[in-house]
């Protein structure tokens, strides 16, 4: 088992996932590709929690770059033992992974709440309302009710798709950070076993 390479793999994955989270969150601000709803403040309250931008995005880049840095070969070591420094680095990566868990957890929770509440839309009564808030998420199973939202166009599909993507991406980030916690603990305790001869591809 090569703990450094595993961490690097996780790091690169997290960068990609973080960028996707940021993109998904930004798209939530532009239902149907229009800017007017953001300027009129006619967006779901959970869009303003920046769960994809901050939680699953920026906050995830910190652990990602820490994990990527773990595989570098110029680790100075300590007490004359090269592996000791690498062990310290692996254990410190656990802290970074915990930050990642917090960020991805935040992203997952907000996305789940956003899905459960449904979008803010102009309902069949001509009011801006959380039309599906009282359905406890049941609206997700009954697409015939989605026409209750008259504006923005396709807002239910837009919200459901993007919050689902954030939920999935946040969930994957959470799992990867959890794996890195285990990887970091094992790497720190068992030692940094990668030799220059071993080549692992992600």
């Amino acid at each position: 088992m090569c703990y450094g390479k595993c961490a690097r793999c996780i790091g690169h994955s997290l960068v990609g996932l973080a960028l996707l989270c940021i993109a998904a969150n930004i798209l939530l601000y532009f239902p149907n590709g229009e800017t007017k709803y953001a300027s009129e403040n006619h967006l779901s309250r959970f869009v303003w929690f920046f769960s994809g931008i901050v939680g699953g995005g920026l906050l995830m880049l910190l652990p990602a770059f820490v994990f990527i840095g773990l595989e570098q070969d110029d680790c100075c070591g300590c007490c004359g033992h090269e592996n000791c420094g690498k062990r310290c680095a692996m254990l410190s990566s656990v802290l970074a992974a915990l930050i990642g868990i917090a960020g991805s957890g935040y992203c997952v929770i907000v996305a789940a709440l956003g899905l459960a509440e449904g979008p803010l839309c102009l309902d069949s009564l001509g009011q801006w309302n959380y039309t599906f808030a009282s359905t406890e998420g049941q609206y997700l199973l009954d697409t015939s009710t989605w026409s209750e939202c008259t504006e923005p166009k396709h807002i239910v599909e837009w919200n459901v798709s993007l919050f689902s993507i954030l939920l999935a991406l946040g969930g994957i980030e959470f799992i990867l950070c959890l794996i890195q916690v285990i990887n970091g603990v094992l790497g720190g305790i068992c030692g940094f076993c990668c030799s220059h001869q071993q080549q692992y591809d992600c």
């Epitope: 069949s124 009564l125 009011q127 026409s147 008259t150 504006e151 166009k153």
Partner: antibody
Framework: EVQLVQSGAEVKKPGASVKVSCKAS????????VKWVRQAPGQGLEWMGW????????IYAADFKGRVTMTTDTSTSTAYMELRSLRSDDTAVYYC?????????????WGQGTLVTVSS | EIVLTQSPATLSLSPGERATLSCRAQ?????INWYQQKPGQAPRLLIY???NLASGIPARFSGSGSGRDFTLTISSLEPEDFAVYYC?????????FGGGTKVEIK
């Protein structure tokens, strides 16, 4: 001046269709909804549904679902209401009405009305 | 469907008198709007949101009420006030109107 101008009176046979137009002027058409109401001779007012002029999404009253189609043409600021399978009890004055979205959703501007007579 | 019952169906009064029109909802609603209609004309908005006077409407018209019971009051009838008055709710679909109260000259 804010106004809604409707098309002229129509006489139709039972089973036929009628399409009433409603041209808006004096305001930004897509900022308000358009509601359709009818009034049979000597009777009260009956709501038929409304259309979101920005998205074109209509909401129909249950009594008219499947028989009515509401559309808009934003390029000419015109709303349309088509009623199919006409019966004699569809004889009424049909009004288009502007309303503002929000808490009270009141109907402040009314068209002059279009009399549709269904007779064999 | 929320049924609105207006009473009385006809109100016979003289100019200068006070008119009180009632609108009762079958179940509790958040607000009501009032309209005036004269023969051969489209209805005209008088009161919106239960108590707010529409633009260009004289101050002799006022609205009040909450829950199920709502009232339109004309403090002193003018000759042009003799017409049919409708209340309307849109707290839930379908939007409904009351049957109307005709205010006629005694």
């Amino acid at each position: 001046e804010v106004q809604l101008v409707q098309s002229g009176a129509e006489v139709k046979k039972p089973g036929a269709s009628v399409k009433v137009s409603c041209k808006a002027s004096g305001y930004t058409f897509t900022n308000y909804g358009v509601k359709w109401v009818r009034q049979a001779p000597g009777q009260g007012l009956e709501w038929m549904g409304w259309i979101n002029t920005y998205t074109g999404n209509p909401i129909y009253a249950a009594d008219f679902k499947g028989r009515v189609t509401m559309t808009t043409d934003t390029s000419t600021s015109t709303a349309y209401m088509e009623l199919r399978s006409l019966r004699s009890d569809d004889t009424a004055v049909y009004y288009c009405v502007r309303f503002q979205y929000g808490d009270y959703r009141y109907f402040d501007v009314w068209g002059q009305g279009t009399l549709v007579t269904v007779s064999s | 469907e929320i049924v609105l019952t207006q009473s009385p169906a006809t109100l016979s009064l003289s100019p200068g008198e006070r008119a009180t029109l009632s609108c009762r909802a079958q179940s509790g609603i958040s607000f009501i709007n009032w309209y005036q209609q004269k023969p051969g004309q489209a209805p005209r908005l008088l009161i919106y949101g239960t108590a707010n006077l529409a633009s260009g409407i004289p101050a002799r018209f006022s609205g009040s009420g909450s829950g199920r019971d709502f009232t339109l009051t004309i403090s002193s009838l003018e000759p042009e006030d003799f017409a049919v008055y409708y209340c309307q709710q849109w707290s839930s679909n379908p939007l409904t109107f009351g049957g109307g109260t005709k205010v006629e000259i005694k």
